[in-house]
């Protein structure tokens, strides 16, 4: 059995978050993993929740009673998601903490804006133009 | 020319984002996208890149001077990133709209946890577990 | 300060056996994954094995595949490299070395190393 | 697997810079970090660039670290030359795999 899964039942119940009741309305994540198939799809997705589990991490940092339990999933993840790559996780990390309300961060981004945009489509890196990027579909 | 390029050039204006004193102190996204070669890679990198900008561009929604620019530059983001799925665009802005200090929302990540861990990596998939997963380097 | 010190070393046949040990102190030796490096005489350095902090995931170079064995005891602060079937190769100064982080990648500190001779 | 390829020596006067390029066979060289290490003679390693550029405390600011995607390159470069600079240099990376690499090595002779 993965470490994680121990310490995921002790967040459960610091958070009671085991009552059956937590699952009424639908879910948060499992719902959308479900949806898609393709992995880039699903890295898509899942950039998103890891990015949210860090998150609320680092809300309950302080927290002595859960850290033991936080930091054994953090690490799982670096593992699962990151594939083990420091490097990959401190790129995701900076891409996280830049803050939308710095000018500076602003300024930059808005310069950068026509080059990251070019790089979108993994048409952009092969040349090729997939019709299916002329229309915004329903 | 695809029609954000004008787009941007007028966002340039507009943040004062044009002057070469912005490219300072390194680049927010483009050396991050630089390292990252692997389509799936690159879309855990892109998905925080994209969610950055659409937190950016809410921002200024009320912003008239800049709305056709701003519309624009979404619509070919739409386009190229979620490969104009409209569904894939939903579910990627449900996930960027969760509130991590939400209670309910707390209760639910921790309660979808353990699978949401289950999913994170390739082999979980297929069965396979790859050495490479096993140890976090450097 | 961190301190890494190795013994074990010395003359062994060909074939024969030799256990190198590689006693840590100045950090929670338990939170950072461990190698061995080592280097021949007048060579350049290869890695050899590597650790984790629990010691639950190990990690061996090709050329030691199946007849070295890496191993800690995190109560005793001292990581381990058994090495079975020695060969005229394994000729080398062997270096214990710390991990920057519970992770391969930057070896932070370094041990001042043991040599192991294996010769007939 | 991969490799990592140094020049075997570089010599240069003192107060003079150096440069030594690491270029990396198999996978790119920028998702991975590299580290540098000085080895004196008769001495145990020692870091002087980790994470592509970082400088541990106590390594002077003479030694940087970059990386170039276009080469595929990492490259040390040593400025203001000194006679204590005079070892061998060692660029290190790892893969996907769990394989730690070190480079051949690189004699930095002070003239």
């Known amino acids: 059995q993965d470490p994680y899964v121990k310490e995921a039942e002790n967040l459960k119940k610091y958070f009671n978050a085991g009552h059956s009741d937590v699952a009424d309305n639908g879910t948060l994540f499992l719902g959308i993993l479900k949806n898609w198939k393709e992995e880039s799809d699903r890295k898509i997705m899942q950039s998103q929740i890891v990015s949210f589990y860090f998150k609320l991490f680092k809300n309950f940092k302080d927290d002595q009673s859960i850290q033991k339990s936080v930091e054994t999933i953090k690490e799982d993840m670096n593992v699962k998601f990151f594939n083990s790559n420091k490097k990959k996780r401190d790129d995701f990390e900076k891409l996280t903490n830049y803050s939308v309300t710095d000018l500076n961060v602003q300024r930059k981004a808005i310069h950068e804006l026509i080059q990251v945009m070019a790089e979108l489509s993994p048409a952009a890196k092969t040349g090729k133009r997939k019709r299916s990027q002329m229309l915004f579909r329903g | 020319q695809d029609p954000y390029v004008k787009e941007a050039e007028n966002l340039k204006k507009y943040f004062n984002a044009g002057h070469s004193d912005v490219a300072d102190n390194g680049t927010l996204f483009l050396g991050i996208l630089k390292n990252w070669k692997e389509e799936s890679d690159r879309k855990i990198m892109q998905s925080q890149i994209v969610s950055f900008y659409f937190k950016l561009f809410k921002n200024f929604k009320d912003d008239q001077s800049i709305q056709k620019s701003v519309e624009t530059i979404k619509e070919d983001m739409n386009v190229k990133f979620f490969n104009s799925n409209k569904k894939k665009r939903d579910d990627f802005e449900k996930l960027t709209n969760y509130s991590v200090t939400d209670l309910n929302v707390q209760r639910k990540a921790i309660h979808e946890l353990i699978q949401v861990m289950a999913e994170l990596s390739p082999a979980a998939k297929t069965g396979k577990r790859k050495r490479s997963q096993m140890l976090f380097r450097g | 300060e961190v301190q890494l010190l190795e013994s074990g070393g010395g003359l062994v046949q060909p074939g024969g056996s030799l256990r190198l040990s590689c006693a840590a102190s100045g950090f929670t030796f338990s939170s950072y994954a461990m190698s061995w490096v080592r280097q021949a005489p007048g060579k350049g350095l290869e890695w050899v094995s590597a650790?984790?902090?629990?010691?639950?995931?190990?990690y061996y170079a090709d050329s030691v595949k199946g007849r070295f064995t890496i191993s800690r005891d995190n109560s005793k602060n001292t990581l381990y490299l058994q090495m079975n079937s020695l060969r005229a190769e394994d000729t080398a100064v062997y270096y214990c070395?710390?991990?920057?982080?519970?992770?391969?990648?930057?070896?932070?500190?370094w041990g001042r190393g043991t040599l192991v001779t294996v010769s007939s | 697997n991969f490799m990592l390829t140094q020049p075997h020596s570089v010599s240069e006067s003192p107060g003079r810079t150096i440069t030594i390029s690491c270029t990396r066979s198999?996978?790119?060289?920028?998702?991975?970090?590299v580290q540098w290490y000085q080895q004196r003679p008769g001495t145990a390693p020692t870091t002087v660039i980790y994470d592509d550029k970082k400088r541990p405390s106590g390594v002077p600011d003479r030694f940087s670290g970059s990386i170039d995607s276009s080469s595929n390159s990492a490259s040390l470069t040593i400025s203001g030359l000194k006679t204590e600079d005079e070892a061998d240099y060692y660029c290190q990376s790892y893969d996907s795999n769990n394989l730690v690499v070190f480079g051949g090595g690189t004699k930095v002779t002070v003239l």
């Open positions: 070395a710390k991990d920057g982080w519970n992770a391969l990648g930057w070896l932070e500190s």
């Open positions: 198999g996978g790119s060289i920028g998702s991975y970090y």
């Open positions: 650790i984790s902090g629990s010691g639950g995931s190990t």
